[in-house]
Interface confidence: low
């Protein structure tokens, strides 16, 4: 686990002709805010693919009013870092997307208007725990200067935040082969699981499954005393078993200073030079308080009762996260009814409705039959948002405009012959059957005569209608 941090230094018009004077439109003053999106790997991903590593939104910057006579300087920016917490291992390779948004504060119907001003996408390699990386990127006529880094959160350490620390057991030093755990000198690295049977006293491992021997010991499980051993060239805590030195780090090896602090060795110890916003022996304590305005998106800041948190943000509806930096996925609440598609536009939700429905949540069922006539005596029927006509006999199709063959469905039973008729159809029954569809057998002693075809019709001719 850890945090990716992005610090925006400046955003303004790039060099060269055609640089814009102001980010604001003619509608009046505006202010800027930033969105950062992290995606794993170095592959070119679609812009709309999810920010799988996380995303964050900055606070709104100060209001900017265009001064038409003067070229735009670096624009007033939101204060503070953009922080994107990550739960799992830091991937090392990632795509960084930084969006600059403009919020127009003129008289807008329905509140402020948002628009994307610039977007930079860069694929990067970065180890956790390293120093700030600085970058300058151009997006159209705009130039963005920023720094970023990834840092682990205890107990995770290492370039991928996958190694864990544990409190050290011995008061004097870490156990055999275990280094002091940066960035906390009073903790030791949690040992990896060594090869089964590896001597606890004389062996250690840096990778799971291995068994490396301390000086003076040998064998696959470090059980065999070595006849001779040289302890030269090694530094670190003294081994009580052999009087030799176990390989170990110098005070600044692995950089014990957290949060981008730089380490300098002092006699027998080290000292951290911390960046702004962090302090403590190892720069491990964040100096952010409510006075620094850490709560984004209108969150209310209160001093934390928990000693480990100097402040707590109470987030407004629609936002969450320790700094109210994460927008709640409002579409997960399925606000759109009747199969509407939910779109979270950032400043608002929008429902894209299916045909036959309307309204902010597609809650309104349109009158499908309004203004829609069914031809040839058909009747309009509403249902499920779909317009449908119930057609008169002899007609079919969506609007009853197509002539239908009433005999196509072979309605006459027992071999009866079907004759299309202006009022529908007539069945001429085979001997021994009767009824409008020839469905009834005639009494054995009765005789049934085949009725003559209506004038002008030939039997079985469906093409001719009166």
């Amino acid at each position: 686990a850890g945090v990716f941090e992005l610090q925006i230094h400046s955003f303004g018009p790039g060099p060269g002709p055609g640089a814009p004077r102001s980010p604001c439109s003619a509608r009046g003053p505006c202010r800027l805010f930033f969105r950062v999106c992290l995606k794993p790997g170095l592959s070119e991903e679609a812009a709309e693919s999810p920010c799988a590593l996380g995303a964050a939104l900055s606070a709104r910057g100060p209001v900017y009013t265009e001064q038409p006579e003067a070229p735009a300087p670096d624009l007033p920016l939101p204060n503070g870092l953009l922080q994107v917490p990550f739960r799992d291992a830091w991937p090392g390779t990632f795509s960084l997307i930084i969006e600059t948004w403009r919020e127009e504060l003129g008289d807008q119907i329905g509140g402020p208007a948002w628009s994307l001003l610039a977007r930079v996408t860069r694929r990067r390699r970065l180890a956790a725990g390293g120093p700030w990386a600085r970058d300058i990127q151009r997006a159209g006529a705009w130039e963005l200067r920023f720094s970023y880094r990834a840092r682990c959160e205890l107990p995770a350490v290492g370039t991928a935040c996958t190694r864990l620390c544990r409190p050290r057991s011995a008061p004097s030093r870490c156990g055999p082969g275990l280094r002091p755990c940066a960035p906390l000198e009073d903790e030791c690295e949690a040992p990896p699981v060594c090869r089964a049977g590896c001597s606890l006293e004389h062996g250690f491992c840096e990778q799971p499954g291995e068994c490396r021997c301390l000086e003076g010991w040998t064998g696959p499980l470090c059980m065999v005393p070595a006849s001779t051993s040289s302890c030269l060239g090694l530094r670190g805590p003294s081994s009580a078993t052999t009087g030799c030195l176990v390989p170990g780090p110098g005070p600044c090896d692995g950089n014990p200073c957290a949060n981008g602090g730089s380490c300098s060795e002092t006699p027998g110890s080290f000292e951290c030079t911390c960046p702004r916003g962090f302090y403590g022996l190892r720069c491990e304590v964040s100096g952010v308080t409510c006075a620094d305005g850490p709560c984004f998106n209108g969150g209310l800041c209160v001093g934390g009762a928990d000693p480990d948190s100097a402040y707590i943000c109470h987030c407004p509806p629609g936002f969450q996260g320790s700094n109210c930096e994460k927008r709640v996925d409002r579409c997960s609440l399925q606000p759109c009814r009747n199969g509407g598609l939910c779109l979270d536009l950032g400043h608002a939700l929008r429902c894209r409705c299916r045909a036959g429905f309307a309204g902010p949540r597609c809650e309104h069922n349109l009158d499908d039959c309004a203004g829609r006539a069914c031809a040839n005596g058909g009747t309009c029927v509403e249902g499920g948002g779909a317009h449908r006509c119930s057609c008169a006999l002899g007609f079919g199709g969506r609007d009853c405009r197509e002539r239908a063959d009433p005999c196509a469905a072979r309605p006459c039973a027992h071999g009866g012959r079907c004759y299309a008729h202006f009022s529908g159809l007539v069945c001429a029954c085979a001997p021994g059957y009767m009824g409008s569809r020839c469905e009834f057998p005639v009494h054995p002693d009765g005789v049934s005569a085949l009725p003559a075809a209506p004038p002008g019709l030939r039997p079985g001719d469906p093409q001719r209608y009166l």
Epitope: E271, C272, T273, P275, R276, G277, Y279, G280, L281, E284, V285, G287, V288, T289, A291, D292, G304, P307, D308, A310
Partner: antibody, heavy 118, light 108 residues
Framework: QVQLQESGPGLVKPSQTLSLTCTVS??????YYWSWIRQPPGKGLEWI?????????NYNPSLKSRVTISLDTSKNQFSLKLSSVTAADTAKYYC????????????WDQGTLVTVSS | EIVMTQSPGTLSLSPGERATLSCRAS???????LAWYQQKPGQAPRLLIY???SRATDIPDRFSGSGSGTDFTLTISRLEPEDFAVYYC?????????FGQGTKVEIK
């Protein structure tokens, strides 16, 4: 309102250990850094060291070998021990709270003058 | 360590005048880690400015701080009788915390 009150002897013999205690009232000792600063007569301020509520300490390298700052959260107190004192350690000793975020000293006590003399 | 040098050592002014005190660091100091204090005889120092330019609680607005990098300034726009004292700057960009040697503002 946070208040700090020092206690300890005003006179210490050379080579002995200077011991001072600072009691915090009006607020919890937890979640802040607490520091000691001294000022020799007629001179400027010198930072001695600090301690965090979890016991982490940082000392001025010029005094590091002789300084111990400790904390008793149950009594809302923190203490200074300066060993092997000499006349050069004669000063007014202040305890102070460090403002979270700017590392400035926002609350001070009135100070105790400690004289090192036989 | 970062050495903080204040100038002038003594500033002789009359009430109502403007006082400008300088503090120079031997290496760059982040804005967030520079503070100014006022100390009157027999009293503890009192925090005036933190973060180079933010006034501490209950500090009158005639006190203002500015500067960045290695050069910082404390300005008292109009000296009041109670402002005559010694002023110290202090940094904690790099351990150890260090103070300037002080500037004494005295009545002319």
């Amino acid at each position: 309102q946070v208040q700090l009150q020092e206690s300890g002897p005003g006179l210490v013999k050379p080579s002995q250990t200077l011991s001072l205690t600072c009691t915090v009232s009006g607020g919890s000792i937890s979640s802040y850094y607490w520091s000691w600063i001294r000022q020799p007569p007629g001179k400027g301020l010198e930072w001695i060291g600090y301690i965090f509520y979890n016991g982490i300490t940082n000392y001025n390298p010029s005094l590091k070998s002789r300084v111990t700052i400790s904390l008793d959260t149950s009594k809302n107190q923190f203490s200074l021990k300066l060993s092997s004192v000499t006349a050069a350690d004669t000063a007014k000793y202040y305890c102070a709270r460090i403002h979270s975020g700017s590392f400035s000293f926002d609350y001070w006590d009135q100070g105790t003058l400690v004289t090192v003399s036989s | 360590e970062i050495v903080m040098t204040q100038s002038p050592g003594t500033l002789s002014l009359s009430p109502g005048e403007r006082a400008t005190l300088s503090c120079r660091a031997s290496q760059s100091v982040s804005r967030g880690y520079l503070a100014w204090y006022q100390q009157k005889p027999g009293q503890a120092p009192r925090l005036l400015i933190y973060g180079a330019s933010s006034r501490a609680t209950d500090i009158p607005d005639r006190f203002s701080g500015s500067g960045s990098g290695t050069d910082f300034t404390l300005t008292i726009s109009r000296l009041e009788p109670e402002d005559f004292a010694v002023y110290y700057c202090q940094q904690y960009d790099t351990s150890p915390i260090t103070f300037g040697q002080g500037t004494k503002v005295e009545i002319k």
